[in-house]
Interface confidence: medium
C-alpha cells in the first residue's frame, strides 16, 4: 500500500513538475527590466527564451521573436537545449510511469516489469529535473554577469559626463517557476525510484509464502525460491521446487488439499 502511494505521489509530483518546466520554457518573463531608479515605468521590457516583449502604460504590448538562430548567444541556445531535453525526457518518463503504476493493470504485465518501468521513469524524471534546474541556473548566472557588467558601465562616468544609457535585466518569474518545477520533477523521480525498490521485494515475499507443497512426496524448500527484483535473469517469476520448475500458472492449475495462506 505504501509503495503504491509513493509511486502515485511520485507520478503526480513529477507531472506537476514537468507541466511547470513546459510553462517556464514557454514563458516570456525569463528576464525582466530592472526598475532600480523608477519603480513605475511607462515602458516595461521583458525577455524570454523565444522572444522579447515591451509593455506600455497604455496596455499596448508587443512581443517579437528571435528570428535568427546563429545570431543568438551560445548560452541562450544551451538553455533552450537543456529545457527541451528536460521536457522530452519528462514526457517520456510520464508515458512510461503511467504503464508502471501499480494501480493500473495492463494485460498480464508482471510486477517485475512494472518495477523496471518505475525505475526507468524515476531516472528520467531525475535527469529531466536536473536539466531544468541547470538550464534556469545557467540563464540566471548569465543575467547576474550582465547585470554587474552594465552596473559597472553605468558608473564609469568621467569628467562629470555620464555614459550612454543601459537597460539592466533581473530575474523574471520564469526562473522561479523553472527552479520549483525542476525541483518537483527531481523529487518525483526520487519517489519513483524509492517506489521501485519497494515493488519487487514486497511481491516476492508474498509469493514465497503463497504456496504449499501439493503432496507429501514434494518437500518444500524455502531456500529454493529465487527472488526476482526485475534485474536478474529470472524474469518469469518461476518457483523452484524439488519436483521440477513449474510456472505460477501451473501451480494454480493443480490446487492441493491445502488452502492458500
Amino acid at each position: 500500500m505504501a509503495v503504491t502511494a509513493c509511486q502515485g505521489l511520485g507520478f503526480v509530483v513529477s507531472l506537476i513538475g514537468i507541466a511547470g518546466i513546459i510553462a517556464a520554457t514557454c514563458m516570456d518573463q525569463w528576464s525582466t527590466q530592472d526598475l532600480y531608479n523608477n519603480p513605475v515605468t511607462a515602458v516595461f521590457n521583458y525577455q524570454g527564451l523565444w522572444r522579447s516583449c515591451v509593455r506600455e502604460s497604455s496596455g499596448f504590448t508587443e512581443c517579437r521573436g528571435y528570428f535568427t538562430l546563429l545570431g543568438l548567444p551560445a548560452m541562450l541556445q544551451a538553455v533552450r537545449a537543456l529545457m527541451i531535453v528536460g521536457i522530452v525526457l519528462g514526457a517520456i518518463g510520464l508515458l512510461v510511469s503511467i504503464f508502471a503504476l501499480k494501480c493500473i493493470r495492463i494485460g498480464s504485465m508482471e510486477d517485475s516489469a512494472k518495477a523496471n518501468m518505475t525505475l526507468t521513469s524515476g531516472i528520467m524524471f531525475i535527469v529531466s529535473g536536473l536539466c531544468a534546474i541547470a538550464g534556469v541556473s545557467v540563464f540566471a548566472n548569465m543575467l547576474v554577469t550582465n547585470f554587474w557588467m552594465s552596473t559597472a558601465n553605468m558608473y564609469t562616468g568621467m569628467g562629470g559626463m555620464v555614459q550612454t544609457v543601459q537597460t539592466r535585466y533581473t530575474f523574471g518569474a520564469a526562473l522561479f517557476v523553472g527552479w520549483v518545477a525542476g525541483g518537483l520533477t527531481l523529487i518525483g523521480g526520487v519517489m519513483m525510484c524509492i517506489a521501485c525498490r519497494g515493488l519487487a521485494p514486497e511481491e516476492t515475499n508474498y509469493k514465497a509464502v503463497s504456496y504449499h507443497a501439493s503432496g507429501h512426496s514434494v518437500a518444500y524448500k524455502p531456500g529454493g525460491f529465487k527472488a526476482s527484483t526485475g534485474f536478474g535473469s529470472n524474469t518469469k517469476n518461476k518457483k523452484i521446487y524439488d519436483g521440477g520448475a513449474r510456472t505460477e500458472d501451473e501451480v494454480q492449475s493443480y490446487p492441493s488439499k491445502h488452502d492458500y495462506v
Epitope: N37, N38, P39, V40, T41, S58, R64, V165, T167
Partner: antibody
Framework: QELKESGGRLVTPGGSLTLTCTAS?????????MCWVRQAPGKGLEWIAC????????TYYATWAKGRFAISKTSSTTVTLQMTSLTAADTATYFC???????????????WGPGTLVTVSS | AYDMTQTPASVSEPVGGTVTIKCQAS??????LAWYQQKPGQPPKLLIY???TLASGVPSRFKGSGSGTQFTLTISDLECADAATYYC????????????FGGGTKVVVV
C-alpha cells in the same frame, strides 16, 4: 543617426499638407516610436502624434490632433504626417523626433530633426 | 489629463549662479519625466530622463529631482552656454493628453 523633415511650405487656410520624415543611420523597429512635435514662432513645444516602430500598428495622438492629423509609416525609414483643414494656428516649425523606448523605459525623445516650417496664410 | 505646468516662464541669473525650474504634473507620473534644453534655431536636446538621470554627455551641473507630481531642474555654476529655454516633458503616457510638454522656462545668463 539623423532625421530630416521635408514638405513644409506655405499653405492656404483650409488646405492640406503632408510632411515626410526620413531617417538615416537607423531603421524603425520595436525599440522606437517616431513622433511629430511642433513649435509655433516664439512659443513652446507641442506634441502632436507618435507611431510605433515595430510591426504592430500603434499610434498615439494629442487630443486636439485627432481627426485632423494622421501619422503613418510608409517604409522602414520614412514616416509621414498628413494635416487637413489647416488654420493660421497651425503655423509652426514641425519637428520629427524619435522616442527610444527600450533603453529609457519611457517616452523620452533622444533624436530630433532640424524641423520644417509650415506657414498657413492666405 | 497629465497637464504639465512649468514655472517660472523666464529667469535671469549671473554667471556662476544657480537656477531652479519647477515642473508640476496634474496627475502622478511617478519618475517618468524628462528635461530638454533648446537654443534658438535648434531642435531640443535631452538633458535628464527618469526625473534625475543625466543623459549622455550632460555635465553634472545639471541636477533633476522629484517624483509623483512635483519635479525640479537645478542648474548650478551657470555658464553663458546654459542660456536657453528649458522644457519638462511627462514621459509616462501618451493616452488622452493635450500636450506632453511644459510651457518652457527661458534662462538668461547675465
Amino acid at each position: 543617426q539623423e532625421l530630416k523633415e521635408s514638405g513644409g511650405r506655405l499653405v492656404t487656410p483650409g488646405g492640406s499638407l503632408t510632411l515626410t520624415c526620413t531617417a538615416s543611420g537607423f531603421s524603425f523597429n520595436s525599440n522606437y516610436y517616431m513622433c511629430w512635435v511642433r513649435q509655433a514662432p516664439g512659443k513652446g513645444l507641442e506634441w502632436i502624434a507618435c507611431i510605433y516602430g515595430g510591426t504592430t500598428v500603434n499610434t498615439y495622438y494629442a487630443t486636439w490632433a485627432k481627426g485632423r492629423f494622421a501619422i503613418s509609416k510608409t517604409s522602414s525609414t520614412t514616416v509621414t504626417l498628413q494635416m487637413t483643414s489647416l488654420t493660421a494656428a497651425d503655423t509652426a516649425t514641425y519637428f520629427c523626433a524619435r522616442e527610444d523606448l527600450t533603453a529609457y523605459s519611457s517616452y523620452v525623445i533622444t533624436l530630433w530633426g532640424p524641423g520644417t516650417l509650415v506657414t498657413v496664410s492666405s | 489629463a497629465y497637464d504639465m505646468t512649468q514655472t517660472p516662464a523666464s529667469v535671469s541669473e549671473p554667471v556662476g549662479g544657480t537656477v531652479t525650474i519647477k515642473c508640476q504634473a496634474s496627475e502622478t507620473i511617478y519618475r517618468n519625466l524628462a528635461w530638454y534644453q533648446q537654443k534658438p534655431g535648434q531642435p531640443p536636446k535631452l538633458l535628464i530622463y527618469a526625473a534625475s538621470t543625466l543623459a549622455s554627455g550632460v555635465p553634472s551641473r545639471f541636477k533633476g529631482s522629484g517624483s509623483g507630481t512635483q519635479f525640479t531642474l537645478t542648474i548650478s555654476d551657470l555658464e553663458c552656454a546654459d542660456a536657453a529655454t528649458y522644457y519638462c516633458q511627462q514621459a509616462y503616457t501618451r493616452v488622452n493628453i493635450d500636450n506632453a510638454f511644459g510651457g518652457g522656462t527661458k534662462v538668461v545668463v547675465v
